[in-house]
């Protein structure tokens, strides 16, 4: 049942990416939808040795990753605003989960290049649009109505069954033949009691 609901959720949430609408828009597929979440791909040139990559949602810093090297060429990777991220030799991927309408926004990859010099900042981005498919919307509209109707039918059914049961019971009580049989039983009981007293 749980997996069924999950697949329904996956089916309902679709992601559309509108790039090229902003300056410095990504010239690659920036958003990759999978497992009910989105992978936001922030690329950097292979030559870059040390950098800071920030994921911005509008103007807010959601995630960051900094890669530096020490005097012994030892690599240090830090995150001040931690997100699930993945580093490769030419990209940083940030992962966002449990998507809903509030995630729909402009997302930017803010790259600060420390090494090689000169220090440089580049901004690339795109719009992450989360929409529901027509069928999903129809389902979402009719599902509660259907459920409500089902509940109403169940209640009405219960009422009807109760009423029929009551009717059947009351009809057996008011049957003339039945009444005579009942009276006979009462009379017989009365007589036996009187006999007991007499004796």
């Amino acid at each position: 049942m749980k997996s069924g609901l999950w697949y329904f959720f996956l089916f309902c949430l679709r992601i559309k990416v509108l790039t090229g609408e902003i300056n410095g828009s990504a010239n690659y597929e920036m958003f990759i939808f999978h497992n009910g979440g989105v992978q936001i791909l922030c690329k950097y040139p292979d030559i870059v040795q040390q950098f800071k990559m920030q994921l911005l949602k509008g103007g807010q810093i959601l995630c960051d990753l900094t890669k530096t090297k020490g005097s012994g060429n030892t690599v240090s990777i830090k995150s001040l605003k931690f997100c699930h991220s993945q580093l490769s030799n030419n990209s940083v991927s940030f992962f966002l989960y449990n998507l809903d309408h509030s995630h729909a926004n402009y997302y930017f990859c803010n790259l600060s290049i420390f090494d090689p010099p000169p220090f440089k900042v580049t901004l690339t981005g795109g719009y992450l649009h989360i929409y529901e498919s027509q069928l999903c919307c129809q389902l979402k509209f009719w599902l509660p109505i259907g459920c409500a109707a089902f509940v109403v039918v169940c209640i009405l059914g219960c009422i009807l069954i109760c009423w029929l049961t009551k009717k059947k019971y009351s009809s057996s009580v008011h049957d003339p033949n039945g009444e005579y049989m009942f009276m006979r039983a009462v009379n017989t009981a009365k007589k036996s009691r009187l006999t007991d007293v007499t004796l």
Partner: antibody, heavy 117, light 111 residues
Framework: EVQLVESGGGLVQPGGSLRLSCAAS????????MDWVRQAPGKGLVWVSN????????EYSPFVKGRFTISRDNAKNTLYLQMNSLRAEDTAVYYC??????????WGQGTLVTVSS | DIVMTQSPDSLAVSLGERATINCKSS??????????LTWYQQKPGQPPKLLIF???TRETGVPDRFSGSGSGTDFTLTISSLQAEDVAVYYC?????????FGPGTKVDIK
Amino acid sequence: EVQLVESGGGLVQPGGSLRLSCAASGFTFSDYWMDWVRQAPGKGLVWVSNIDEDGSITEYSPFVKGRFTISRDNAKNTLYLQMNSLRAEDTAVYYCTRWGRFGFDSWGQGTLVTVSS
Amino acid sequence: DIVMTQSPDSLAVSLGERATINCKSSQSLLSGSFNYLTWYQQKPGQPPKLLIFYASTRETGVPDRFSGSGSGTDFTLTISSLQAEDVAVYYCHHHYNAPPTFGPGTKVDIK
């Protein structure tokens, strides 16, 4: 302007301990790896130790490993070098340096450590 | 550990003349497209100063008479026209791996 000011040097007996400090200003201290480099009187430069931005990575020269400990306090913008079991060959001017991504781009004036009985 | 050697130990050059310092590493300092070699200048009574990084890139504010060249294991620092303020000891240094090491230095004087 980047400034690095070392302190804590002085005369110490062999086997003794000393703690050097380096007060940093003029830059975001927590964004940089920091190093200690020493220079014996009339000799060349020798790298001693380094530490990454938050202190989670430290490295040491084979000459001082196990005897010296590098640390930092980013809240105080200060770099430290705890020197134990000092030897005569540790006598040198100790420089605090900023590793500026691809070279030691800022140096303090140095503090002299003399190990002698 | 990588061993750095420099030659000559010292040299005296006339003002305006060219000074050339050589540095050799015991193994290649080339990684990708970068040579992990830097040059420092240390004037008497002063701390060292970064001149050249990645074997050939001048640090900001360093006069263009200073230039670096070489790749792999052999590197050169050239002062194209020696000035009085260039009197110093020059060190090469690698940061290819840990521990980073310095060359023994080359002292440059005016003839």
